[in-house]
């Protein structure tokens, strides 16, 4: 069955996927839709690349990573409980019978309900995607640099968001991930 | 919502070419995947190829040194040839399109017979 | 090329009743098979794709499950609309192969 991905509602959501290119830059056509992987290509496509570039998008989906490194993971960002489902993410590796397809299954759940803090602060605009990281590898670590004043609750979530997003990183290993050439 | 029609001769001498029309509506064969599939009168159906958004193809593999498949984007047309038909390809033909074959024309029914 | 085995090739049902079509693959096929009603002079209309998933607007009397090798797909409260012959559908790889069809007649 699909492997699951969790996220809470108003967090980005990420969606592992990667590709091993043949040589540097000879990059494999890629997309990313909504729903199971169909007949052919993606349906519902939220994200596409090409040999070269991230060529099609919407609003709020992303590649986070060094997709000309193959990695083509997708952010998606600010989810809601609508944003629940599967997400096909296909490899088109040219020739006959080649493509590969992975079905991730994302699963939004409801925020945590917590106090309202006495000094509210814009979180994003404190750290601008700062949580997500484009490198892979265990020992890679994040660095925060100069903490802001922040509430005890949003430590909290960034610890985990952390944690989710270490994570995210060692799923290379075990996720969607292929060799070409 | 898509629509497809076949049309073309309901009999074929054997060794013949096979000719077959698919008109579309409600759609742009500019954009999609558009598929030929058969069914043999002992009810086998048989995926044939397609012709895509870019004009790429793809045969089946048994078939593949027969058939053709070409298309007119300003008529909204896309066309089925077989060639040196046998009694064999005596079927429904079909044309479908759609993320799971989701659209289908009724069929043209075609037999092969001298 | 993935040889789809569908059985029985025909059953005979009652209305109100519910009947399980069956589909082996020669191979793992990732969930990826379609279910398709057809009837004499239409061309078959798609009602379940990736196993399960319900086309919109498909009632859900029918439903599909299964994984690796072995599917089915069930009809319960027939009526007499269902009466028809299935097939399944593989589409792991672009040699797509179908079952060879169930004839469901009432009985």
């Known amino acids: 069955s699909e492997v699951e991905y969790r996220a809470e509602v108003g967090q980005n959501a990420y969606l592992p996927c990667f590709y091993t290119p043949a040589a540097p830059g000879n990059l494999v056509p890629v997309c990313w839709g909504k729903g199971a992987c169909p007949v052919f290509e993606c349906g519902n496509v939220v994200l596409r690349t090409d040999e070269r570039d991230v060529n099609y998008w919407t609003s709020r989906y992303w590649l986070n990573g060094d997709f000309r490194k193959g990695d083509v993971s997708l952010t998606i960002e600010n989810v809601t409980l609508a944003d629940s489902g599967i997400y096909c993410c296909r490899i088109q590796i040219p020739g006959i019978m080649n493509d590969e397809k992975f079905n991730l299954k994302l699963v939004i759940k409801p925020a945590k309900v917590t106090p309202a803090p006495t000094r509210q602060r814009d979180f994003t605009a404190a750290f601008p995607r700062m949580l997500t990281t484009r490198g892979h590898g265990p020992a890679e670590t994040q660095t925060l640099g100069s903490l802001p004043d922040i509430n005890l609750t949003q430590i909290s979530t960034l610890a985990n968001e952390l944690r989710d997003s270490r994570l995210a990183n060692d799923l290379r290993d075990s996720g969607a991930t292929i060799r070409i050439g | 919502e898509v629509q497809l029609q076949e049309s073309g001769p309901s009999l074929v001498k054997p060794s013949q070419t096979l000719s077959l029309t698919c008109s579309v509506t409600?759609?742009?064969?500019?954009?999609?995947?558009w598929n030929w599939i058969r069914k043999f009168p002992g009810n086998k159906l048989e995926y044939m190829g397609y012709?895509?958004?870019?004009?790429?193809?793809y045969y089946n593999p048994s078939l593949k040194s027969r058939i053709s498949i070409t298309r007119d984007t300003s008529k909204n047309q896309y066309y089925l040839q077989l060639n040196s038909v046998t009694t064999e390809d005596t079927a429904t033909y079909y044309c479908?399109?759609?993320?799971?074959?989701?659209?289908w024309g009724q069929g043209t029914t075609l037999t092969v017979s001298s | 090329d993935i040889q789809m085995t569908q059985s029985p090739s025909s059953l005979s049902a009652s209305l109100g009743g519910k009947v399980t079509i069956t589909c082996k693959a020669s191979?793992?096929?990732?969930?990826?098979i379609a279910w398709y009603q057809h009837k004499p002079g239409k061309g078959p209309r798609l009602l379940i794709h990736?196993?399960?998933t319900l086309q919109p607007g498909i009632p859900s009397r029918f439903s599909g499950s299964g994984s690796g090798t072995d599917y089915s797909f069930s009809i319960s409260n027939l009526e007499p609309e269902d009466f028809a012959t299935y097939y399944c559908l593989q589409y792991d790889n672009l040699l797509f192969t179908f079952g060879s069809g169930t004839k469901l007649e009432i009985k």
């Open positions: 990736y196993t399960s």
């Open positions: 479908a399109t759609g993320n799971h074959f989701d659209y």
């Open positions: 012709i895509n958004y870019s004009g790429s193809t």
């Open positions: 191979q793992d096929i990732n969930k990826y």
């Open positions: 409600g759609d742009s064969i500019t954009s999609g995947y």
